[in-house]
């Protein structure tokens, strides 16, 4: 309705004597700003005067405020939106209707708000979930329809009158929609909390009691049980009787069924609170408990361990491990069912009693072949002695023993010979199934344990064999002592250390890596010509003409070996320089003349310099100097200089003659 003023605020506000009221309020006037505001208590419209009568708690006009209860009642609003009010302190006789009389330039409005002030602080209200189950977290809510900025309060939770340890979360609301204070407590109740009283206590800022609300907890839980047994230690002998009783200490709701379990499995036809076991057997030993159910679920008692005692049963022997490896450790375990556990054991090896062995386990730290055989045992407890079982067999395994490699050939062995070797051994468990040879090669094994090396290599120094069952036993290596011609013959320059320059003293060494036998002879050759018979070849002053391909030979009684050809390179400064001319030393003007600087040098010339007949430097660096077009005045003697890393060399003068062309002669 566009003819109404629009207000928003809580419909009713609650407080008590001496507290305060905070009234959150918003409005929208029909036109313009608020010009006059009066707060009435229980206003009544007077038709005669066309005005409202009633107690004026607050007044604000264009002319200014009229003092009444202005200190107690405060208008905290403004001229267009906010109409929030505060009454502090609030009294019992403030209960009733508050009337907000609003006037703008052309419009008027009366807005009514209910105020409920009680004599004493009213109690909060506890809200519980519809059902509470043990160990399931629930939220307890305590709600109070009150909140005021000028009157701080607190809500505290108590269980059976004792403050609760859990942290509560308190929230307040002071909005146009609602005014309240709320405390929420998260809580995981146990079955023992069933029937206990929970209190939410309203306190002032100093912790002084104002009011409270209480509820009794109804905690649904499975039955809680106690089990009793006769005899109390639950230890009996075969043939004795046992009684177990189940007692319910708490159940919510009431229990519905009873059952008994042994080792987690339900016992058939046992549905009463008493379990009677007559003439028990050893099979009835185990863990017993009773189970009682209600609508929440089953509850179980603690377990009772019933022990039925009996003499040892026939024993068996377990070996860790068989077959056993020689040198390893072995453990024998005597296994016999008995209650109480056996206190004494007697051990037998191949039917003969083992002295001093009375424990459940026998440990042999280092097994030897003679430990093999049958092991058995007898167990004994307070109720009697058991029987000796069938026993267990220990197999002791070991690698082949005393392995040797034997050379079948006559000595000495030469490179290229065929060598036969055999692999022998003394004893083995299990049997030898294969042989290995070191080093590995593409060798023939004509029969088990025999090796044939065709065309034996110079470097076949030693051979070893292994006889293998589950393990391999290696023999000591045998030396073949193969004889061969000198190997890896090569020429090595020992002087100078750097590159060879013309005029240097040069020494070449003939090296080889090995020879057997060691006695050797040397030969040097260049281009098929014998030069010397020493291990070194020496040049006092090397010349470029000594450059070439050198080889050396080394022989012993087995044969002779040559080196790879070694190139001797002699470095020298450019020499034999000359200037050649193309197309010739006589050229017609206007044509092209190319001067080439020819030389012999090692390394080759890296840099050329050109000069004319007056030794003036020409701006060229390459081997060729090109004059195009050539002129008559270019006639003259030219020379070049060649440079390499060793030094410089210069050519003699070469004369270029440039003659006039027919055209020039014709013009003269």
């Amino acid at each position: 309705d566009s003819s109404k003023w629009v207000f928003e605020h809580p419909e009713t506000l609650y407080a008590w004597e001496g507290a305060c009221v905070w009234i959150p309020c918003t409005y929208r006037a029909l036109d313009g700003d608020l010009e006059s505001f009066i707060l009435f208590h229980n206003p009544e419209y007077n038709k005669n005067t066309s005005k409202f009568d009633g107690t004026r708690l607050y007044e604000s006009t264009k002319d200014g405020k009229v003092p009444s209860e202005q200190k107690r009642v405060q208008f905290l609003g403004d001229k267009n939106k906010n109409c929030t009010l505060s009454i502090h302190p609030v009294h019992l006789n403030d209960s009733g209707q508050l009337g907000l009389r609003m006037e703008s330039k052309t419009e008027k409005w009366m807005e009514r708000i209910h105020l409920n002030v009680s004599e004493r602080p009213f109690p909060p209200h506890i809200q519980l979930p519809p059902e509470i189950q043990e160990s399931q977290e629930v939220t307890l809510t305590c709600l109070l329809n009150f909140s005021c900025y000028g009157y701080p309060i607190q809500l505290q939770w108590l269980l059976e009158g004792v403050p609760m340890r859990q942290a509560a979360v308190t929230s307040t609301s002071l909005t146009i929609k609602s005014v309240f204070t709320r405390s929420e407590l998260k809580f995981s109740p146990q079955w023992s909390h069933h029937g206990k009283i929970v209190t939410c206590q309203l306190q002032d800022a100093d912790g002084k009691f104002l009011s409270n609300d209480t509820v009794q907890l109804n905690v649904k839980h499975t039955p809680k049980l106690e089990i009793k047994v006769t005899p109390s230690d639950a230890i009996v002998r075969e043939g004795d009787s046992v009684t177990m009783t189940c007692e319910v200490s708490s159940s919510n709701p009431e229990y519905t069924t009873v059952s008994w379990l042994k080792d987690g499995t339900s016992l058939k036809k046992q549905n009463t609170f008493t379990l009677n076991l007559r003439e028990v057997t050893k099979d009835q030993s185990g863990k017993y408990c009773c189970q009682v159910s209600n609508d929440v679920g089953p509850g179980r008692s603690e377990e009772v361990f019933l022990q039925v005692q009996y003499a040892p049963e026939p024993s068996t022997v377990q070996i860790l491990h068989s077959p056993a490896v020689e040198g390893s450790q072995v453990e024998f375990l005597c296994m016999s069912l008995a209650n109480p556990l056996p206190t004494n054991y007697t051990w037998y090896h191949n039917g003969k009693e083992m002295q001093g062995r009375t424990e459940e386990k026998v440990h042999i730290p280092k097994i030897l072949p003679w430990h093999a055989g049958t092991y058995s045992c007898v167990a004994e407890n307070i109720l009697g002695t058991g029987q000796r079982g069938p026993g267990a067999e220990l197999d002791v395994q070991y690698p082949p023993k005393k392995v040797t490699t034997v050379i079948q050939n006559p000595m000495p062995i030469r490179e290229g010979d065929t060598v036969t070797l055999s692999c022998n051994y003394n004893s083995s468990n299990p049997s030898v199934t294969r042989y290995e040879w070191k080093p590995h090669g593409a060798w023939e094994e004509p029969s088990l344990g025999v090796l044939k090396i065709q065309n034996v290599g110079w470097d076949n120094t030693t051979i070893a064999c292994a006889a293998c069952n589950s393990w391999c036993s290696w023999a000591s290596p045998v030396a073949l002592n193969v004889q061969y011609a000198p190997r890896d013959v090569r020429v090595r320059k020992i002087k100078p250390l750097s590159e060879i320059h013309s005029g240097n003293s040069v020494s070449l060494q003939c090296d080889f890596s090995s020879s057997h036998p060691k006695e050797v002879q040397f030969f040097w050759e260049k281009n098929g010509r014998l030069l010397g018979k020493e291990s070194q070849l020496n040049f006092d002053s090397i010349s470029p003409e000594d450059a070439g391909s050198y080889s050396c030979w080394v022989n012993n009684s087995i044969g002779q070996t040559a080196s790879k050809a070694w190139t001797l390179e002699v470095l020298y400064a450019p020499r034999r320089l000359r200037v050649s001319m193309s197309p010739g030393d006589q050229v017609m003007e206007g044509k092209s003349a190319t001067l080439t600087c020819e030389s012999d040098a090692n390394p080759p010339v890296s840099h050329y310099t050109w000069f004319d007949w007056n030794n003036q430097s020409l701006p060229y660096h390459s081997q060729k100097l090109r004059l195009e077009p050539v002129k008559v005045q270019h006639s003259g003697a030219y020379w070049c200089q060649g440079t390499n890393s060793v030094g410089k060399g210069r050519s003699p003068l070469s004369t270029l003659t440039v003659y006039y062309s027919p055209e020039t002669i014709g013009r003269r």
């Epitope: 840099h607 310099t609 000069f611 004319d612 007949w613 007056n614 003036q616 430097s617 020409l618 701006p619 060229y620 660096h621 390459s622 081997q623 060729k624 090109r626 004059l627 002129k631 005045q633 270019h634 003259g636 200089q641």
Partner: antibody
Framework: EVQLQQSGPGLVKPSQTLSLTCAIS??????????WNWIRQSPSRGLEWLGR?????????DYASSVRGRVSINVDTSKNQYSLQLNAVTPEDTGAYYC?????????????????WGQGTMVTV | QSALTQPASVSGSPGQSITISCTGT?????????VSWYQQHPGKAPKLMIY???NRPSGVSNRFSGSKSGNTASLTISGLQAEDEADYYC???????????FGTGTQLTVL
């Protein structure tokens, strides 16, 4: 301080001859430790050496193979200057033309580096 | 005669170092130690910065250095400054019928 001052027209018609002059101050065109060069620059061809002249016991000149046959470099010793003549020009010859000196660095060693340059002449064909 | 190959552009921040490469053949860069480097600002003539691979003319900052390996020469500018922004050209003596060859040029930008 050696300076090279260039002169010559900035606009030449196709098929005509381009003539540029380079006046030397602070050095002599007759120096036997210098070469006197012409270099041009265009966006399409970049920097391009065209030719040089130098005096030793007599006068020598060299030309780039790309212009050989239509180029000549002449010297006027009295004015201490050298010039470039490029015949039968085409729009391809458009660019900035520079004269430059190359100097013998020590004794007989040429650095082949242009240590002094003219201000350049922009020639449009 | 083909021009020597240079990267079209290189950039660096003030204070940084940059290197410009110049690749030729065994007939030019690889065959002779006559590589030179030039700096050219827009509208100006080239200026010699390095000659004979690694020599600096007097008046050129020691921030500029040159080197050569095989057929490739390099110009390194250390402690880059705003005024170094320019085009850079390499040049080499060559044994072909034209004795000099220049590089394609590299534009240096100082960020």
């Amino acid at each position: 301080e050696v300076q090279l001052q260039q002169s010559g027209p900035g606009l030449v018609k196709p098929s005509q001859t381009l003539s540029l002059t380079c006046a030397i101050s602070g050095d002599s065109v007759l120096s036997n430790s210098d070469t006197w060069n012409w270099i041009r620059q265009s966006p399409s061809r970049g920097l391009e050496w065209l030719g040089r002249t130098y005096h030793r016991s007599t006068w020598y000149d060299d030309y780039a193979s790309s212009v050989r046959g239509r180029v000549s470099i002449n010297v006027d010793t009295s004015k201490n200057q050298y010039s470039l003549q490029l015949n039968a020009v085409t729009p391809e010859d458009t660019g900035a033309y520079y004269c430059a000196r190359d100097r013998l660095q020590d004794g007989n060693s040429w650095s082949d580096a242009f240590d002094v340059w003219g201000q350049g002449t922009m020639v449009t064909v | 005669q083909s021009a020597l190959t240079q990267p079209a552009s290189v950039s660096g921040s003030p204070g940084q170092s940059i290197t410009i490469s110049c690749t030729g053949t065994s007939s030019d860069v690889g065959g002779y130690n006559y590589v030179s480097w030039y700096q050219q600002h827009p509208g100006k003539a080239p200026k010699l910065m390095i000659y004979d691979v690694s020599n600096r003319p007097s008046g050129v900052s020691n921030r500029f250095s040159g080197s050569k390996s095989g057929n490739t020469a390099s110009l390194t500018i250390s402690g880059l400054q705003a005024e170094d922004e320019a085009d850079y050209y390499c040049s080499s003596y060559t044994s072909s019928s034209t004795p000099y060859v220049f590089g394609t040029g590299t534009q240096l930008t100082v960020l």
